[in-house]
Amino acid sequence: PRSIEVKYIGVKSAYVSYDAEKRTIYLNITNTLNITNNNYYSVEVENITAQVQFSKTVIGKARLNNITNIGPLDMKQIDYTVPTVIAEEMSYMYDFCTLLSIKVHNIVLMMQVTVTTAYFGHSEQISQERYQYVDCGRNTTYQLAQSEYLNVLQPQQ
């Protein structure tokens, strides 16, 4: 096994707001990550960088620094929030996300996350990519892995 294992668990919550004038959607997406330290000593998680893509366009980025210290043979669950904006050339989504005649306004987003840890004289980076459903029509709290989008063309990593 890797000395450090990173597992993207899923979307924990998505909080939505709109700007009707600009036909813009603001989504604050909180994701959950499990980081396991298989070393015999504590390891520093130096940073987590994340970005969210919609339709191959980056709609949000986030970076967390000096996250945590993980003890030997231990695991920590970390939540991180990526503020996203769906606007401009994607403002057509405003109509879909605010449509009252449908209950669930799921869109497919690609979550990318890179975890950087200090390990044996160098910084080790571990990346994960996952497609997830997010409801852009209301504030939603998800059961972990509930929002997973299974796409045979994009198998889980």
């Epitope: 000395s3 396991t36 298989n38 070393n39 015999y40 000593y41 504590s42 003890g71 030997p72 043979l73 231990d74 695991m75 200090a118 390990y119 044996f120 004289g121 160098h122």
Partner: antibody, heavy 120, light 112 residues
Framework: QVQLQQSGAELIRPGTSVKVSCKAS????????IEWVKKRPGQGLEWIGV????????NYNEKFKGKATLTADKSSSTAYMQLSSLTSEDSAVYFC?????????????WGQGTTVTVSS | DIVVTQTPLSLPVSFGDQVSISCRSS???????????LSWYLHKPGQSPQLLIY???NRFSGVPDRFSGSGSGTDFTLKISTIKPEDLGMYYC?????????FGGGTKLEIK
């Protein structure tokens, strides 16, 4: 004071399994790792594996994967090692020891050892 | 796996002698944070192994100062300055940095 009290000697038939216990006292059980070590007559010490009792995460010597299973019960501050499909090669004294998370102290306190004899 | 080579296999001594035991690892035992997990143990027949030295050179509580450890990276030494009867037994080094932990083959300290 720190103590690791191991279960008593076992005489086991080949092909069966045995579970050795290691009860910790005198310190915070989940703040230390528990190591397991094998000693056969005329041979050196052999490291089997280690468990973090807080997380339940284990790491094994490749040689003992499938042979030893390490678990821990936080409520009773007891670590366990189950040995399966026993053969005469598994006849040995098995020790548990604790290791500090924070410092470089590995296996500072040891149990008294449990003798496992595999014989028909 | 890290190979830990201990020499000599056997060490015949007289009481009062000073002796050295060597332990060499196939890879550096110093991790990213500068810690080196190298320990020394004495195992006497019918007893549990006892920790003598941890982190290369730190004497464990209650261990007499005639025991000392030194070294860095891949080469380590245990010195016993004045051998006493209670020092006889098997000495082992253990590397605790890399997965899996590995013991040296042992050095038997015995009377000439």
């Amino acid at each position: 004071q720190v103590q690791l009290q191991q279960s008593g000697a076992e005489l086991i038939r080949p092909g069966t399994s045995v579970k050795v216990s290691c009860k910790a006292s005198g310190y915070a059980f989940t703040n230390y790792l528990i190591e397991w070590v094998k000693k056969r007559p005329g041979q050196g010490l052999e490291w089997i594996g280690v468990i973090n009792p807080g997380s339940g995460i284990t790491n094994y010597n490749e040689k003992f994967k499938g042979k030893a299973t390490l678990t821990a019960d936080k409520s009773s501050s007891t670590a366990y090692m189950q040995l399966s499909s026993l053969t005469s090669e598994d006849s040995a004294v098995y020790f548990c020891a604790r290791s500090d998370f924070i410092t470089t102290v590995v296996a500072d306190y040891w149990g008294q050892g449990t003798t496992v004899t595999v014989s028909s | 796996d890290i190979v830990v080579t201990q020499t000599p296999l056997s060490l015949p001594v007289s009481f009062g002698d000073q002796v050295s035991i060597s332990c060499r690892s196939s890879q550096s035992l110093t991790n990213y944070y500068g810690n080196t997990y190298l320990s020394w143990y004495l195992h006497k027949p019918g007893q549990s192994p006892q920790l003598l030295i941890y982190g290369i050179s730190n004497r464990f509580s209650g261990v007499p100062d005639r025991f000392s450890g030194s070294g860095s990276g891949t080469d380590f030494t245990l010195k016993i300055s004045t051998i006493k009867p209670e020092d006889l037994g098997m000495y082992y080094c253990l590397q605790g940095t890399h997965q899996p932990r590995t013991f040296g083959g042992g050095t038997k300290l015995e009377i000439k």
